[in-house]
Amino acid sequence: EEELQVIQPDKSVLVAAGETATLRCTATSLIPVGPIQWFRGAGPGRELIYNQKEGHFPRVTTVSDLTKRNNMDFSIRIGNITPADAGTYYCVKFRKGSPDDVEFKSGAGTELSVRAKPSAPVVSGPAARATPQHTVSFTCESHGFSPRDITLKWFKNGNELSDFQTNVDPVGESVSYSIHSTAKVVLTREDVHSQVICEVAHVTLQGDPLRGTANLSETIRVPPTLEVTQQPVRAENQVNVTCQVRKFYPQRLQLTWLENGNVSRTETASTVTENKDGTYNWMSWLLVNVSAHRDDVKLTCQVEHDGQPAVSKSHDLKVSAHPKEQGSNTAAENTGSNERNIY
């Protein structure tokens, strides 16, 4: 009779994580008598996966009844596969011996590759807000996928971005991989409602990529423009002055009125109006008693937006018998959001 051969017909097997891998092995002879063992890897550091003779291998089941003497099918199934199970598996025939069984012949090996889905991409933006025209960086991370080949794209409001750098780690062979990408985005005043999307495509996703998103509302600060206007006389000795705070985001904003440099009133924006682009408008009124002033009055609307240095706009109020409507239309830059009318 020909000498026993151990046949592993599959050079490689590809299995999705969580599924069961079948590793096939047959022997061409019943002799010599002795157990079959399965190992992952070769050499002295090889890992025992299954021993026909003894041991407890809860994830391994045999395809046929290995207790039977006439059995020559030594195929096994390994359940609940994870990327850590990837490697080359060897079916090895031993002959009975003492004190240990003696390795007789090994199969050629079957490489088990595990397809593992990437984790949901996590997109994170800068720690601090930035203003329009500035460039900010967003990062996208996804982990635990295999094989290594993966595609990552960036989008802003559906438009693909091109300014990004991507790394897949580790560079060498591994049971699973991670991807890290950094994209640069130039902010515009219209970006309050914008989204940045990181899209990951992988063979395990069957054409349905995973997406991670970041809202630019978390990143952008649109500073307000200020306009101080003198309204027509409301009463014989009173002048109504308004400060219009326009196009700011986020809403956090504090306004202070100064009369000739002295604080007259401070208020916080609460009831604001929202613009279509997501920015806010707010207006504050100041009623000035002209009779209390003998000289001209310098009124200043000072706005502190989202913790930034204050910006201001001034208006000179002429004290005369018949005050005329006067106005000032100079814009002041800053970032903020919210609106309330104050009387």
Epitope: L30, I31, V33, G34, P35, E54, T67, N71, K96, G97
Partner: antibody, heavy 118, light 107 residues
């Protein structure tokens, strides 16, 4: 049903010959190692011979050169040819199947009695 | 040849008892050891192979352990049908050899 049935046991004179048979049924006979084991009256068990699936044969020193084990797979039969019999060969002879992957005996026949006496 | 020594040679016990029979090999036999049960006028019946694995159909009250040279057979709760003679056998090396037997008798 897996079964082994021995036959051929007899009363024989010292120096004589005898051929024992074991008929196997219920399993793929050619795929199993087969063994003969004997038990002397009031004594323990003694392994007598083995034949592998490839026809390889094994004997203990006590019977080597006198006993010959053989198999006929087409007939699902195992044989033990016993020559130059001695009084010490008197025993119940069992055939047994090396039925497990490691050749542990899993099935035994009911035995056949061989008596060597003048 | 490898010598197999069983102890005790005989043992008296009662129904419900737990009993252990030991078997020692004269040299290391790995764990290729079998246990058999034999009742008067009957063929031996296989109980355990590879020192600790139960043959198909054998109740779990029988258990085997050991490796190398020292082995044991334990019957956890004796029933009337368990009173018989028990043999160990090594089948690592030819010639395969048996222990001399342990006769388990009812007390």
């Amino acid at each position: 049903e897996v079964q082994l049935v021995e036959s051929g046991g007899d009363l024989i004179q010292p120096g004589g010959s005898l051929r024992l048979s074991c008929a196997a049924s219920g399993f793929s006979f050619s795929s199993y190692d087969m063994h003969w084991v004997r038990q002397t009256t009031g004594k323990g068990l003694e392994w007598v011979s083995a034949i592998g699936t490839a026809g390889d044969t094994y004997y203990p020193g006590s019977v080597k050169g006198r006993f010959t084990i053989s198999r006929e797979n087409a007939k699902n039969s195992l044989y033990l040819q016993m020559n130059s019999l001695r009084a010490g060969d008197t025993a119940v002879y069992y055939c047994a199947r090396g039925g497990n992957w490691d050749d542990a005996f899993d099935i035994w026949g009911q035995g056949t009695v061989v008596t060597v006496s003048s | 040849d490898i010598q197999m020594t069983q102890s005790p040679s005989s043992l008296s016990a009662s129904v419900g008892d737990r009993v252990t029979i030991t078997c020692r090999a004269s040299q290391d036999i790995n764990n290729y050891l079998a246990w058999f049960q034999q009742k008067p006028g009957r063929a031996p019946k296989s109980l355990i192979f590879t020192a600790s694995r139960l043959q198909s159909g054998v109740p779990s009250k029988f258990s085997g352990s050991g490796s190398g040279t020292d082995f044991s057979l334990t019957i956890s709760s004796l029933q009337p049908e368990d009173f018989a003679t028990y043999y160990c056998q090594q089948y690592t090396f030819y010639p395969y050899t048996f222990g001399q037997g342990t006769k388990l008798e009812i007390k």
